[in-house]
Amino acid sequence: ALDAAYCFRNVQDNCCLRPLYIDFKRDLGWKWIHEPKGYNANFCAGACPYLWSSDTQHSRVLSLYNTINPEASASPCCVSQDLEPLTILYYIGKTPKIEQLSNMIVKSCKCS
Amino acid sequence: ALDAAYCFRNVQDNCCLRPLYIDFKRDLGWKWIHEPKGYNANFCAGACPYLWSSDTQHSRVLSLYNTINPEASASPCCVSQDLEPLTILYYIGKTPKIEQLSNMIVKSCKCS
């Protein structure tokens, strides 16, 4: 799997999980989240060469198409596969509220 | 939806469905498929600017992050959303066989 265990341990130019820390205030302009101040969002990036972690039949076909037609621009792309939620604390007035924001953290990637 | 109805009608630099015809023999080296000789596989390509058809909370966050940090390399990517199967005819010796190959045709795209 193209997850932290694999990607953060290996220097990989191909599609892999990349570390990305997002500071809510500085990077998103969000002042409403009290805790945490930021989080490890991560992101997916890198080349999708021939059949590198291809996700669907179509992406495998596209990968094969690209190998045989190297001048083609139709190549698979490195995107998130598994996502996890993030629990945040914010205030409505003076009242604290805990909320779970879905699909905020990328855990693994794929070529799609 | 970033489908044929929208994308094939508009000239769009942003993430959209692009037409791609694949000839099985010429483009994939597949001699075993008898019919069809090829098919409209399509593919997804184009930029994913701020909130352009963002798929998940993470891709929306990443989109916003990129707007505030334009030098960042962490941007969403244009990938397939809805896929459809393709029915093929091939031969086992002289005996014809019909098979449905799943996820062979891209019908729409998203920024993920």
Partner: antibody, heavy 120, light 108 residues
Framework: QVLLVQSGADVRKPGASVKIFCKAS????????MHWVRQTPAQGFEWMGS????????TYARRFQGRLVLTADTSTNTAYMELRSLKSADTAVYYC?????????????WGQGSLVTVSS | EIQMTQSPSSLSASPGDRVTITCRAS???????LAWYQQKPGKVPKLLIY???SRAPGVPSRFSGSGSGTDFTLTISSLEPEDAATYYC?????????FGQGTKLEIK
């Protein structure tokens, strides 16, 4: 040049399973159908089945149906043959072979063979 | 399943001889679903002829194939010492693919 490199010789007990790999190089693995054939002095050549990479369509000889699994890993250009519930009659040299293109076809390149001995 | 019967099962011939091996199918294969292979002791089979009469790349022109329906032949027009081997026919008109029992060719 086209090369099909198979795993080495193996000894198995009756009732066990064996899995042989066939690593392809020198051509576009996903464009060709891969076959498995075995050879014994008594039976000669016996075709076992074929697998089409990417789409994972496997065709099996009826006599092996139910205990043979053919797969192809396109990420490593490797085909696999797993034969279960082994009997002494399964002692043979097992070959992977690439076809000229059709599901059933002539086989233009063969692996070096993997000897499997089934003995208690 | 289609049975493939080769004849003769063995033969001995001299360099320069013309040699013919026949293969009979238990049912019609049509005109192009037959292949011929050469196998030397301890070696892997080598494709000689496919589609009943098409020579595989790199195969010397002294090897030729003919036939259709149920009767097929492999001909070596002028035997060379390196042609000593066992020759097999194979049908791929129907599943399962089946092979002949082999013809062992010895050079005198």
């Amino acid at each position: 040049q086209v090369l099909l490199v198979q795993s080495g010789a193996d000894v198995r007990k009756p009732g066990a399973s064996v899995k042989i790999f066939c690593k392809a190089s020198g051509y576009t693995f996903s464009s060709n159908v891969m076959h498995w054939v075995r050879q014994t002095p008594a039976q000669g050549f016996e075709w076992m089945g074929s697998v089409i990479p990417i789409v994972d369509i496997a065709t099996y000889a009826r006599r092996f149906q139910g205990r043979l699994v053919l797969t192809a890993d396109t990420s490593t250009n490797t085909a696999y043959m797993e034969l279960r519930s082994l009997k002494s009659a399964d002692t043979a040299v097992y070959y992977c072979a690439r076809t000229l293109g059709l599901v059933l076809d002539a086989m233009d390149y063969w692996g070096q063979g993997s000897l499997v001995t089934v003995s208690s | 399943e289609i049975q493939m019967t080769q004849s003769p099962s063995s033969l001995s011939a001299s360099p320069g001889d013309r040699v013919t091996i026949t293969c009979r199918a238990s049912q019609s294969l049509g005109s192009s679903y037959l292949a011929w292979y050469q196998q030397k002791p301890g070696k892997v089979p080598k494709l000689l002829i496919y589609g009943a009469s098409s020579r595989a790349p790199g195969v010397p022109s002294r090897f030729s194939g003919s036939g259709s329906g149920t009767d097929f032949t492999l001909t070596i027009s002028s035997l060379e010492p390196e042609d000593a081997a066992t020759y097999y026919c194979q049908q791929y008109a129907d599943s399962p693919i089946t092979f002949g029992q082999g013809t062992k060719l010895e050079i005198k």
